[in-house]
């Protein structure tokens, strides 16, 4: 139903959904701190622009008795319950921040007339792609897929001279919310990734994964998985691995690889880690001091959501335009705004663009080194280390199929 918005006459409110089910197990207090820090910045920016208005946030908490699992996979109704609460209280702001769970966002988007923008720190799944009033501030699965397909096809780098067209995907169902949807997208038979690959098999059991590592009859040398190094170690341990196996470890929201004193454990030598380029100033910021490297991105997305709203509010107010219109609701895309840690770019569909970084373990230094970066906005690869000290033969990534011989140009569709 149509709810009146607290969004006019110089007073602008942000509705922040504080849900029990969340993409990351982050104390709600930390998210509140991030939002409040964002509000301070927005107020300052509006004041500097000569706009004398009030911006506040209302935190909407769901019923902890009903929705207390903390697990996104049981989140479908929580968002709708919160919207009902908002509706009953007649307390809708100009913009909705949250939810972060894909199920929840999808259901809310499906069951409501969204005449206001929704900003999500999460909603990673393909089912949340191409939603006209949804903005996602953490890399969605579609962005990961485009990188992987691009990298698979690459065969003109001195360290990657074979196009790949095959892969195993390890997915055992215990993944974190981001990983669950990333792997779900790779598994989906109708996805871009599946369409572009000639062979793809999902490994669901630990033993299946472990057997592949030395199986002479394996159909691919490449295994994609999602999680941190510890997750890989629990699965792989110190087992022997065939020399032409490449494990791609997707670990986007983890800054630990870039810390100075980090040494790569030996079990990471056959692994390429895909992560995001780390922020500069986050380490010393007040809201992130208590956060682990993995959680920073989540809280930062909430903060940036506030800054995005401030950016759009400023533009509309300066142009004398109404905030409670479909135009405003549809405007949170195809733009760059000043985020907490530098410029943040949103694509035509309101999804955040970022620089993905592919790391390898140097056999010389036992350090993680940058192999290449990938700009999701322009789908472009930027090689960094042209002569990597790989564990693989001739410092080149192997062919994806053993014994395919000197054929460099294979393309299977």
């Amino acid at each position: 139903s149509q709810v009146s918005q607290n969004c006019h006459n110089g007073s602008y409110e942000i509705s922040v959904l504080m849900m029990g089910n969340s993409a990351f197990a982050e104390p709600l207090k930390n998210l509140e701190d991030a939002v409040n820090e964002g509000l301070e910045i927005v107020r300052g920016r509006l004041q500097n622009a000569g706009l004398n208005v009030t911006v506040n946030a209302t935190f909407m908490y769901s019923d902890g008795l009903i929705h207390n699992s903390g697990d996104c996979r049981s989140s479908t109704c929580e968002g709708l319950d919160l919207l009902r609460k908002i509706s009953n209280a007649q307390r809708m702001g100009c913009v909705l921040i949250g939810p972060s769970c894909t199920y929840s966002t999808f259901q809310m988007y499906l069951d409501t007339e969204l005449s206001y923008p929704m900003i999500s720190a999460g909603s990673f799944g393909l089912s949340c792609d191409y939603k006209e009033t949804l903005t996602r501030l953490m890399s969605p699965a579609r962005k990961l897929m485009y990188f992987l397909v691009n990298f698979w096809k690459t065969n003109d780098l001195p360290f990657k001279t074979y196009s790949w067209s095959t892969s195993y995907v390890y997915k055992n169902g215990t993944e974190t919310e981001d990983c669950f949807w990333y792997l779900n997208a790779l598994e989906a038979s109708v996805s871009y990734f599946s369409h572009e690959l000639g062979f793809k098999v999902v490994l669901r059991q630990d033993k299946e994964f472990q057997d592949i590592l030395m199986d002479h009859n394996r159909k691919s040398n490449v295994i994609i998985m999602c999680g941190g190094p510890e997750f890989l170690y629990k699965l792989k341990g110190d087992r022997a691995v065939a020399e032409d196996i490449v494990i791609i470890l997707v670990d986007l929201f983890n800054d630990q690889y870039f810390e100075d004193n980090v040494t790569a454990p030996d079990y990471m030598k056959n692994v390429l880690v895909l992560t995001l380029s780390p922020g500069n100033s986050l380490l010393n910021s007040s809201f992130s001091r208590n956060l682990s490297p993995t959680k920073r991105d989540f809280a930062l997305a909430y903060l940036n959501g506030i800054l995005l709203f401030g950016h759009m509010l400023k533009i509309f107010l300066e142009n004398g335009e109404n905030i409670t219109t479909p135009k405003f609701a549809h405007a949170f895309r195809n733009l760059t705004f000043e985020g907490y840690d530098g410029p943040v770019t949103l694509d035509d569909w309101g999804d955040v663009d970022s620089t993905m970084v592919l790391l390898y373990t140097s056999v010389d230094t036992k350090k993680y080194k940058v192999l290449l970066t990938y700009d999701t906005h322009v789908n472009k690869t930027y090689p960094v280390d042209m002569s990597p000290t790989f564990t693989w033969k001739n410092s080149k990534l192997p062919n994806d199929i053993t014994g395919r011989g000197p054929q460099h140009h294979h393309h299977h569709h």
């Epitope: 003109d156 001195p158 360290f159 940058v370 960094v384 410092s395 000197p406 460099h408």
Partner: antibody, heavy 118, light 106 residues
Framework: EVQLVQSGAEVKKPGASVKVSCKAS????????MNWVKQAPGQRLEWMGV????????NYNQKFKDKATITRDTSASTAYMELSSLRSEDTAVYYC???????????WGQGTTVTVSS | EIVLTQSPDFQSVTPGEKVTITCSAS?????MYWYQQKPDQSPKSWIY???NLASGVPSRFSGSGSGTDFTLTISSLEAEDAATYYC?????????FGGGTKVEIK
Amino acid sequence: EVQLVQSGAEVKKPGASVKVSCKASGYTFTDHNMNWVKQAPGQRLEWMGVMNPKFGTINYNQKFKDKATITRDTSASTAYMELSSLRSEDTAVYYCARDDYPNYFDYWGQGTTVTVSS
Amino acid sequence: EIVLTQSPDFQSVTPGEKVTITCSASSSVNYMYWYQQKPDQSPKSWIYRTSNLASGVPSRFSGSGSGTDFTLTISSLEAEDAATYYCQQYHDYPPTFGGGTKVEIK
């Protein structure tokens, strides 16, 4: 418009060192690798090394590992190559060349002539 | 390292004629890159990834080939095409260049 402007010609005595600069403009310096290429009189072009300005990663051609040292100043959008222990066979034109993968060496500097003579 | 051998070393051609320059690699590569250099100028990127013309390169130029044998072709030579053309590979490290082919206007 992308431009790579190199420092002027140098004449050096054997045993000396020389530092050649390459100032980039018209693009984001840290987004593209910078290569150095040698062209000695009557010889083919020889690739010496490459640097990624953002991460500071440097790869040398083994042949020039003890001869060349590549550095950069990102605040000045400038790459440098220092040649040490100069000998007569180091007499050449040295070029910096940007990568715009997949088009390697897409823009070149105008070249710096280094003459080594006693 | 991969050695690239260009032929011919020198070619004197009448305007309007077709020019073919070949580059042979000592081992198989996926792609070849070509550069044009005029006297007292720096090299210019001319063809990348075997057959893609760099920005501003006239369509009379084309590139082809695979494996160890690659070709740069000028369909109808013009006076401004007089230059030395170098092939280059980046399949193996380090990248290497051919010895060059000098094209002169007859």
